[in-house]
């Protein structure tokens, strides 16, 4: 904290300009009027202050706006945003997407900080839902943003926003998150034709149920192995050898290299060996011929 001292004669700031670079911290405190600073915040970003000087400027704004800054100031915070704490940001009411973009720009290229996370949280809560424009903006700055949300938070994403999602945005999503996103994607892309639909839905298939995978197998989609390996094991297990062959098309040969990994390993254990042999890939571990398969889960349901 800078102690209160009178501003030296002739040093009172008439405007926010580069001469302030040469002010000591106590001079900034004494000679810069907080109201002037608030109205000329946009100029602060064009002046290479030190972080210590920014601390003083922040302190002045805090005194002027103890209940939280107005959006007109927030939008022009620029590098001063880096000095804000999550507690400061919780006092804000940010409604403009332009304000959000301006502040995300300051943090660009860095990991998502607690300040940014708080800012996004305040913004999204203020909007009530994660609309397409917001999602577009957030994933542009933070490709992993979507996967940082809980399944509960993802449930507020409207299907229309799914159009903004790129494959790389889903790279770090776990199955529980894809379970929530997949039905939304299915709804969003429902009016597209076969091949176009598959291109769009492919990244979300880690949340697809068995019946949807069966339907896709009838459409000559040629799913690649990377996508297949991300499918839910419980969704893959009921697929027949013929269905998997149709689903993968020419990529079916890749099953051999993945036979020890889930879900391929578990799927192989559920297939008849003679069915697996029809693929001609040398897959081993299927149910030997002549064995009877009892579905115990069905038996439990009946009892």
């Amino acid at each position: 904290e800078v102690e209160k001292t009178a501003c030296p004669s002739g040093k009172k700031a008439r405007e926010i300009d580069e001469s302030l670079i040469f002010y000591k911290k106590w001079e900034l405190e004494a000679c810069v009027d907080a109201a002037l600073l608030a109205t000329q915040m946009d100029r602060v970003n064009a002046i290479p202050f030190t972080y210590e000087q920014l601390d003083v400027l922040k302190h002045k704004l805090d005194e002027l706006y103890p209940q939280g800054y107005p959006e007109s100031v927030i939008q022009h915070l620029g590098y001063l945003f880096l000095k804000m704490s999550p507690e400061d940001i919780r006092k804000w009411n940010v409604t403009s997407l332009e304000t959000l973009k301006a502040l995300l720009e300051v943090n660009k290229g860095h990991e998502m900080s607690p300040q940014v996370a708080t800012l996004i949280d305040r913004f999204v809560k203020g909007r009530g839902q994660l609309d397409k424009d917001t999602l577009d903006t957030l994933t542009a700055f933070y490709p992993g943003y979507l996967c940082s949300l809980s399944p509960e938070e993802l449930s507020s994403v409207p299907p229309s926003s799914i159009w903004a999602v790129r494959p790389q945005d889903l790279d770090t999503c776990d199955p529980r998150q894809l379970d929530v996103l997949y039905p939304k994607a299915r709804l969003a892309f429902q009016n597209m034709n076969g091949s176009e639909y598959f291109v769009k839905i492919q990244s979300f298939l880690g949340g697809a149920p068995t019946e949807d995978l069966k339907a896709l197998s009838q459409q000559n989609v040629s799913m690649d192995l990377a996508t297949f390996m991300k499918l839910r094991t419980d969704a893959v297990l009921p697929l027949t050898v013929a269905e998997v062959q149709k689903l993968l098309g020419p990529h079916v040969e890749g099953l051999k290299a993945e036979e020890r990994h889930r879900p391929v390993r578990d799927w192989i254990l559920r297939q008849r060996q003679d069915d697996l042999d029809t693929l001609g890939l040398g897959l081993q571990g299927g149910i030997p011929n002549g064995y009877l398969v009892l579905d115990l889960s069905m038996q439990e349901a009946l009892s």
Epitope: E18, A46, I47, P48, F49, T50, Y51
Partner: nanobody
Framework: LQLVESGGGLVQPGGSLRLSCAAS????????IGWFRQAPGKEREGVSY????????NYADSVKGRFTISRDNAKNTVYLQMNSLKPEDTGVYSC??????????WGQGTSVTVS
């Protein structure tokens, strides 16, 4: 990213020194550069500033007319020519580079004693 200052030393009042601030690991062309000084027991203060293009320079009132800041982008170096030195100019002089519009990168400093 490193900034290294040199050129400091002991000088008599009225004498001159030329400080250099050399960058390694990045190109100075795109950075605004400031020279700062800190006298023993005192707060650090800004002395001089030059924009990334070199088109804009600025000085603290206490050094105006005596100090000149310049840059040689080909040598990746910024200079501070200090003339008519006074005892109150004594201190550790550091250069800093503004990556965005904050002085982000700092050198270790070079000592100047006017006595």
């Amino acid at each position: 990213l490193q900034l290294v200052e040199s050129g400091g030393g002991l000088v008599q009042p009225g004498g001159s020194l030329r400080l250099s601030c050399a960058a390694s690991g990045f190109t100075l062309d795109y950075y605004a550069i400031g020279w700062f000084r800190q006298a023993p027991g005192k707060e650090r203060e800004g002395v001089s500033y030059i924009s990334s293009s070199g088109g804009s320079t600025n000085y603290a009132d206490s050094v105006k007319g005596r100090f000149t800041i310049s840059r040689d982008n080909a040598k990746n170096t910024v200079y501070l020519q200090m003339n008519s030195l006074k005892p109150e100019d004594t201190g550790v002089y550091s250069c800093a580079a503004a990556g965005g519009y904050v002085m982000d990168y700092w050198g270790q400093g070079t000592s100047v004693t006017v006595s």
